[in-house]
């Protein structure tokens, strides 16, 4: 039987994955640093824009793919360059925790997209 149209990850699935990779973790990706981003400027693409630069870190690959799928859905997602603090670098774990906090807030308020 034909395969269905690919379902995008849900916000709930993204939250579950972010919880999974941050719980009981002091660090991620050997303490790699990434640019801090303004998550209010399109959170999926903004977070992806920073996290895409992390390689050799299997722990966040699933998160990267989820963000990519969610970012791909947005109209002209590839066109808009999100606001990024080019002068502020933070650890991957901090960015992921910031994303988790932000996404949880969005989820609670029901503004999924």
């Amino acid at each position: 039987s034909p395969s269905p149209v690919t379902p995008s990850p849900t916000l709930k699935e993204l939250i579950e994955e972010l919880v999974n990779i941050t719980q009981n973790q002091a660090s991620l990706c050997n303490g790699s640093m990434v640019w801090s981003v303004n998550l209010t400027a399109g959170m999926y693409c903004a977070a992806l824009e920073s996290l895409i630069n992390v390689s050799d870190c299997s722990a966040i690959q699933r998160t990267q793919r989820m963000l990519k799928a969610l970012c791909s859905q947005k109209p002209a997602a590839g066109q808009i360059s999100s606001e990024r603090s080019r002068d502020t670098k933070i650890e991957v774990i901090q960015l992921v925790k910031n994303l988790l906090t932000y996404v949880r807030g969005v989820y609670r308020h029901g503004n999924f997209r």
Epitope: P9, N53, G78
Partner: antibody, heavy 119, light 107 residues
Framework: EVQLVQSGAEVKKPGASVKVSCKTS????????MYWVRQAPGAGLEWMGY????????SYNQNFKGRVTLTADKSTSTAYMELSSLRAGDIAVYYC????????????WGQGTLVTVSS | EIVLTQSPASLSLSQEERVTITCKAS??????VAWFQQKPGQAPKALIY???NRYTGVPSRFSGSGSGTDFTLTISSLEPEDVADYFC?????????FGAGTKVELK
């Protein structure tokens, strides 16, 4: 050493389905997704989709209009790609591949499986 | 779907000459471009990821550059074993898409 060994060449009739297998070794199967890419004779590369064996999550290229199904068997560390409603335009070498270093950049590839569609 | 336009389609150069292949994306893909080499009858081999990072074991004569929409693969000094097809890939957005390829031959 990462190894991806694919099943042998297939000849199918138009309208039929084909299922290609990709047996893996040398890494933990559930740690990385399995990607499928095809290449028509003398042509470029076309991404078909991926499956994450950890949770069965898939992403498909919608150009295939629901004709592709990707599955993974954790017990044998084997991934499968099934393509239905075959037509002449599906004649190609089909590759499985994994991405370890950079997300979605396939650096370990199977040897390829030639699928021929002929009545 | 993001379209990658690769040029030239083919080129023929002498040994030790410099090879430049370009890949233009239809929209901003940041630095999410990879380059592959494919020899006849073989599977593709990944050379570069995230625009400029060489995979382990890839000779230093291969280098990548660019960001946004314009990317370049350079072979600083062409060797006989570099005769192959070269493809770019964007890995910013799904579906992942490849350029049509560039055939590199020795004069």
């Amino acid at each position: 050493e990462v190894q991806l060994v694919q099943s042998g060449a297939e000849v199918k009739k138009p309208g039929a389905s084909v299922k290609v297998s990709c047996k893996t070794s040398g890494y933990t199967f559930i740690d990385y997704p399995m990607y499928w890419v095809r290449q028509a004779p003398g042509a470029g590369l076309e991404w078909m989709g991926y499956i994450d064996p950890y949770n069965g999550a898939t992403s498909y290229n919608q150009n295939f209009k629901g004709r592709v199904t990707l599955t993974a068997d954790k017990s044998t560390s084997t991934a499968y790609m099934e393509l239905s409603s075959l037509r002449a335009g599906d004649i190609a070498v089909y590759y499985c591949a994994t991405a370890v270093v950079a997300t979605d950049v396939m650096e370990n590839w199977g040897q390829g499986t030639l699928v021929t569609v002929s009545s | 779907e993001i379209v990658l336009t690769q040029s030239p389609a083919s080129l023929s150069l002498s040994q030790e000459e410099r090879v430049t292949i370009t890949c233009k994306a239809s929209q901003n893909v940041r630095n999410a471009v990879a380059w592959f080499q494919q020899k006849p009858g073989q599977a593709p081999k990944a050379l570069i990821y995230l625009a400029s990072n060489r995979y382990t074991g890839v000779p230093s004569r291969f280098s990548g550059s660019g960001s946004g929409t314009d990317f370049t693969l350079t072979i600083s000094s062409l060797e006989p074993e570099d005769v192959a097809d070269y493809f770019c890939l964007q890995h910013w957005n799904y579906p992942l898409t490849f350029g049509a390829g560039t055939k590199v031959e020795l004069k």
